[in-house]
Interface confidence: low
């Protein structure tokens, strides 16, 4: 006999969220001894029943699920992890990163972190939701629609994996959902932009038009800008993003959103992988999270920051990147873009720490929920005291004091931000302020090597 549950809609809670959360926590703790089941943070692996929908190597794709029976919210998270776009670099990926191409060694459980956590302290936004983590094993930015065959050494079925996961989840409670949030980081973030409308369409066709489908794209809003130093398209990392995607689409039999595809000529579908081009064509509301100085963007632009002195040209290039990115988010009403040098955020445990203009990401997402209320369209007038368009305006990396620690891309060592920015040629006043130093002090310290 199933226990009757009373779903609470936390988006309606206004006023003092901290006080409310404290009450909920206290209630939960007082009820906990009555509960027979242990609170389990883990998401459990389910390989797809339809074994024809596979990872690159033909092993079945799958998803990790943690149900929350009292909730009508479903969070489907698409994992990231670059891509491969020809036989050679896919072979190399299979040798070095097999987990991203095969389900054979996936663990039976995963712990939900960040936005996938069921702890209100770690996830004040959607801790009560049904959590789904979809591992990335198609290497195609979630766009592929081709199976393994004699001709094709690898399957690329990213777009089909999402469709199949949704189909299977309908039998596990998704059919009763009020909101489905398709989220993802890095390649998964781009995957959100490529698939969110298709998921909405799929649910409509299957007879679930009342489920509101929304997107949350983290660190997947890339620019097809000019590289700092042009290199030939040899491997995944040095290949210019436009060229890598152009080649990839053909190799993966990649599919892009229909409305975007219609805007470009045949052979030009690669344009739809770039957020600022695909976003205006999307019907579903999408919240964009993007570091202004994204490490993956810098990597494909052949910028490698090691703390070594930087030429004036590179400093200007980096500042210009932040400016360009800020410009592309100008007309994105729901966005969160801190001026930090980093990559990915939403499934980090400390995703609540970063703020833009005094607002954290979970708070901004809560405001976004409120602004959408029961309609599919974003309200044009922002709610008072509840901002959803949060883009840093200060112009250099790490000028936001809540940025995560800067780490050397190669050694992983924490870098002294003041020195790092000095090497990049930023003016002393600019560098000193967020470090809590006077320019003269900073100059003295750096020049005497202390």
């Amino acid at each position: 006999q199933p226990v009757e549950s009373f779903p609470l809609d936390f988006t309606a809670v206004e006023g003092n969220m901290d006080s409310f959360m404290a009450q909920v926590k206290s209630l939960a703790q007082s009820l906990y001894p009555c509960s027979a089941q242990q609170l389990n943070e883990d998401l459990r692996l389910h390989l797809l029943l339809n074994t024809s929908v596979t990872c690159n190597d033909g092993s079945p794709a799958g998803y990790y699920l943690k149900e929350s029976r009292g909730s009508r919210r479903w969070l489907l998270f698409l994992e990231g992890g670059w891509y491969c776009f020809n036989r050679e670099n896919c072979d190399s990926r299979y040798d070095t990163m097999r987990r991203l191409m095969s389900s054979r060694d996936w663990p039976r459980t995963r712990t939900g972190t960040g936005i996938l956590s069921s702890q209100p302290e770690e996830n004040p936004y959607w801790w009560n939701a049904n959590m789904v983590f979809i591992p990335y094993c198609s290497s195609d930015v979630w766009s592929g629609a081709s199976s393994k065959s004699e001709k094709n050494e690898y399957a690329f079925m990213g777009a089909l994996i999402i469709q199949e996961v949704v189909r299977e989840l309908l039998g596990r409670g998704l059919s009763g959902a009020k909101v489905l949030l398709l989220a993802g980081s890095s390649a998964g973030g781009t995957g959100v932009l490529l698939n969110v409308d298709r998921v909405a369409e799929q649910l409509e066709k299957l007879g679930y038009p009342a489920i509101q489908v929304r997107g949350l794209a983290d660190s997947g809003w890339f620019l097809d800008n000019k590289q700092y130093r042009h290199t030939d398209c040899v491997d995944t990392i040095t290949c210019a993003p436009t060229e890598a995607i152009r080649r990839g689409i053909r190799y993966w039999n990649g599919v892009v959103p229909e409305r975007c595809r219609r805007q470009f000529q045949e052979g030009e579908e690669w344009n739809c992988f770039f957020g600022y081009k695909v976003y205006p064509t999307l019907r579903c509301p999408v919240f964009v999270v993007q570091w202004l100085f994204d490490e993956a963007q810098l990597t494909v632009d052949n910028v490698h920051l090691t703390g070594q002195p930087v030429q004036e040209g590179l400093r200007l290039y980096i500042q210009n990147l932040g400016r360009e990115l800020r410009h592309t988010l100008k007309d994105v009403p729901a966005s969160f873009a801190p001026a930090c040098l980093s990559h990915e955020i939403i499934i980090r445990s400390h995703w609540t720490d970063v703020q833009v203009k005094g607002t954290s990401l979970p708070r901004a997402l809560h405001c976004w929920d409120r602004s959408l209320h029961d309609s599919h369209k974003a309200s044009k007038t922002p709610l008072k005291g509840c901002p959803v368009h949060l883009v840093d305006s200060c112009p250099w990396p790490h000028c936001n004091p809540s940025c995560p620690t800067v780490r050397d891309q190669f050694t992983g060592q924490e870098m002294n931000v003041a020195q790092f920015l000095m090497h990049m040629g930023f003016d002393m006043q600019t560098v000193a302020q967020p470090q809590g130093l006077e320019p003269s002090e900073l100059l003295g310290m750096l020049s005497n090597g202390s």
Partner: antibody
Framework: EVQLVESGGDLVKPGGSLKLSCAAS????????MHWLRQAPEKGLEWVAY????????SYANTMKGRFTISRDNAKKTLSLQMTSLRSEDTAIYYC????????????WGTGTTVTVSS | DIVLTQSPASLVVSLGQRATISCRAS??????????MHWYQQKPGQPPKLLIY???NLESGVPARFSGSGSGTDFTLNIHPVEEGDATTYYC?????????FGSGTKLEIK
């Protein structure tokens, strides 16, 4: 549990020297800038010195420059403050504190060690 | 150095009422939309404890009765409703530039 424990406080004569230590545990010490602060009896809080995570940046309060030296050993997770030419006005409880790198505030404090400078 | 003037020096508030403490900086401690002002509570014989950071952010584990506001040079710490255990000393601190400085403290008494 995140913890800072100071030691080395003592009674010392004016002009004398003393070395304070601070042992860190429960967090990645090498990730954080560290400060020494002090509080004279029945007085307010006063900042003493700062050292960045990799010891690349050192800074001192004006009245302590040249007399105090801050240092750290990341492998041993210890912070030190070498004090020389001590004066009676240096009498205080000395605290080590962790600098949160998201804005320069002190999010973890030690319990303090007492330094008394008197003849 | 930036001087922080805290007021009042002492404050008597009834149990359950609101306590308001002010901190004024001699120069702006805000930059690029962020205010580098923080608040601490210090009980006798104990080290200070962080309550509020970057003007308005509640430190983890601190009750929601504490709140901070302000920008530029004027900042406020509010405690509402005041409880018995809140009777102690409160300090503001800035980290806009080195040296970080503290206010002279406000002693809160509960009646």
């Amino acid at each position: 549990e995140v913890q800072l424990v100071e030691s080395g406080g003592d009674l010392v004569k004016p002009g004398g020297s003393l070395k304070l230590s601070c042992a860190a545990s429960g967090f990645t010490f090498s990730d954080y800038g560290m400060h020494w602060l002090r509080q004279a009896p029945e007085k307010g809080l006063e900042w003493v010195a700062y050292i960045s995570s990799g010891s690349t940046t050192l800074s001192y309060a004006n009245t302590m420059k040249g007399r105090f030296t801050i240092s750290r050993d990341n492998a041993k997770k210890t912070l030190s403050l070498q004090m020389t030419s001590l004066r009676s006005e240096d009498t205080a409880i000395y605290y080590c504190a962790r600098k949160n790198y998201n804005g320069g505030y002190f999010d973890v404090w030690g319990t303090g060690t007492t330094v008394t400078v008197s003849s | 150095d930036i001087v922080l003037t805290q007021s009042p020096a002492s404050l008597v508030v009834s149990l359950g009422q609101r306590a308001t403490i002010s901190c004024r900086a001699s120069k702006s401690v805000s930059e690029s939309g962020y205010s580098y002002m923080h608040w601490y509570q210090q009980k006798p014989g104990q080290p200070p404890k962080l309550l509020i950071y970057l003007a308005s952010n509640l430190e983890s584990g601190v009750p929601a009765r504490f709140s901070g506001s302000g920008s530029g040079t004027d900042f406020t710490l509010n405690i509402h409703p005041v409880e018995e255990g809140d009777a102690t000393t409160y300090y503001c601190q800035h980290s806009r530039v080195l040296p970080p400085t503290f206010g002279s403290g406000t002693k809160l008494e509960i009646k």
